[in-house]
Amino acid sequence: APRGTQAEESPFVGNPGNITGARGLTGTLRCQLQVQGEPPEVHWLRDGQILELADSTQTQVPLGEDEQDDWIVVSQLRITSLQLSDTGQYQCLVFLGHQTFVSQPGYVGLEGLPYFLEEPEDRTVAANTPFNLSCQAQGPPEPVDLLWLQDAVPLATAPGHGPQRSLHVPGLNKTSSFSCEAHNAKGVTTSRTATITVLPQQPRNLHLVSRQPTELEVAWTPGLSGIYPLTHCTLQAVLSDDGMGIQAGEPDPPEEPLTSQASVPPHQLRLGSLHPHTPYHIRVACTSSQGPSSWTHWLPVETPEGVPLGPPENISATRNGSQAFVHWQEPRAPLQGTLLGYRLAYQGQDTPEVLMDIGLRQEVTLELQGDGSVSNLTVCVAAYTAAGDGPWSLPVPLEAWRPGQAQPVHQLVKEPSTPAFSWPWW
């Protein structure tokens, strides 16, 4: 025969009752036992598992004067705000000497109006763009049938006949409200009403129309905006270093963008006050009375180079016999691009102007032909970029060299085609 032959005489004289109710109900389960000697601690089980966090109270009443007399022990388990997780079989458990005893079971059940596990949420959608809404409810009692409503109008003839947990909306052209009703044998519960706000679609085809060193003209194609006309579009431009790398889908620029608003139509805007020869990223969003569209992806653009905005500075020209020494400094005004070099113009009183490309050097020694008797020599210098020459300096007359002045020794460049002077290589 199997091991274990002790007769189990249960100490329980009162077992937990049954509770059935709707969510949120508060109830108490009670069990009572009579034991001889020291009263044991009463534990509660739900579906055979000891409840670690039970809201229980235990009362002990002696039936005699002696500790070894009988005791009545009452344990009460309070269930506050009944939930589905509270349902199941409840028992009391005691360990007495070498015996484990459990009471007869009581049952906690849930029955009432449907309870929403998931309700439709407020959201924004682009005009004419498909989306899904979710709704989920449970009993008991089951089954629970759902009925979707759009702007308070049912989307099916009866509960359970239309879409259930997920409603697919192919697109909206106006802001609408959605809710769902949950029906079971106990009645109907209505979900929250979700507002679906229809925003303009993201603009398309953002592109450059024209470029100037300090301005860019851009255009785009607006997206659909439903029944709500666009009120304006917003363009953002942000400086982008070579290594910065705004990713195509990056939500925010790394620094404060330059923001401009455009009345629409036309869907075009001239962005000014930009830096020449500078990479930017631009994006656009359009707004209706319902709110803004999503931004387009960042589009990389670049302003072209401009010419230097000022002439070279501190030009000095000195003459010593048949040599002329000219030197200058880089313009203080913005170069608007990459400095490629300097041009020098030389002219005497009765001689034609001669142009020279000096390259990036900021000084030159000119070897004058003959005895250097050309009178009233003047020199002008201009800086240039790939976009062209900047403004020329005012003519600087050649001054006679005075003893004590430093005479720079420079590499000389010979240009045989010039009639008045040459650039001999030393």
């Epitope: 579906d47 055979g48 000891i50 670690e52 079989q89 360990f95 459990v102 079971p105």
Partner: antibody, heavy 118, light 112 residues
Framework: QVQLQQPGAELVKPGASVKLSCKAS????????INWVKQRPGQGLEWIGN????????NYNEKFKSKATLTVDKSSTTAYIQFSSLTSEDSAVYYC???????????WGQGTTLTVSS | DIVMSQSPSSLAVSAGEKVTMSCKSS????????????LAWYQQKPGQSPKLLIY???TRQSGVPDRFTGSGSGTDFTLTISSVQAEDLAVYYC????????FGGGTKLEIK
Amino acid sequence: QVQLQQPGAELVKPGASVKLSCKASGYTFTSYWINWVKQRPGQGLEWIGNIYPDSSSTNYNEKFKSKATLTVDKSSTTAYIQFSSLTSEDSAVYYCTRDTYGGSPDYWGQGTTLTVSS
Amino acid sequence: DIVMSQSPSSLAVSAGEKVTMSCKSSQSLLNSRTRKIYLAWYQQKPGQSPKLLIYWASTRQSGVPDRFTGSGSGTDFTLTISSVQAEDLAVYYCKQSYNLWTFGGGTKLEIK
């Protein structure tokens, strides 16, 4: 008095299925978990899983999840373990035992010797 | 999953000698609600079902001789037989029931 009665032996062919029983008496069947334990010849004890008769809630040792299925029949106060696609590795003694929430006493059936052989 | 490790796997002693065997769990077996340690020791003699000796780590089952003592807390547990008798020839298993059940691999006790 508490008793767990198991048949002494079962002989089945490889690839077949078998359902072993454990008849409980002498206590409130729905109030205690029934555990199943495997012991291969000359080997140790391995817990297979358990079932709570009132709700038929089950827990399984991951190793036996695809091999064993636990059920109960409350009307006959009997617990069952069913094995599928039997192989020689399933040859063992299978015990049913009543859980006592870590306390005492605990009651074991005498075990069923399952032999899988062609 | 809780892992139970027993040592040694076997040992041989003479009648009258004291013997100890060890069981280690991979996590604590103390239940904060019931304040009990969910560790039991079983004795299994050849051809028999396992028999409960000790529960709650140190409580001797009714009818078990007092030469059997369980001790330990947290994760390290010991079964001691103070004076081994010939009828103690068996395999001894520890079992956790803190979270489902897991048995140790067993310690085989042989009498010289």
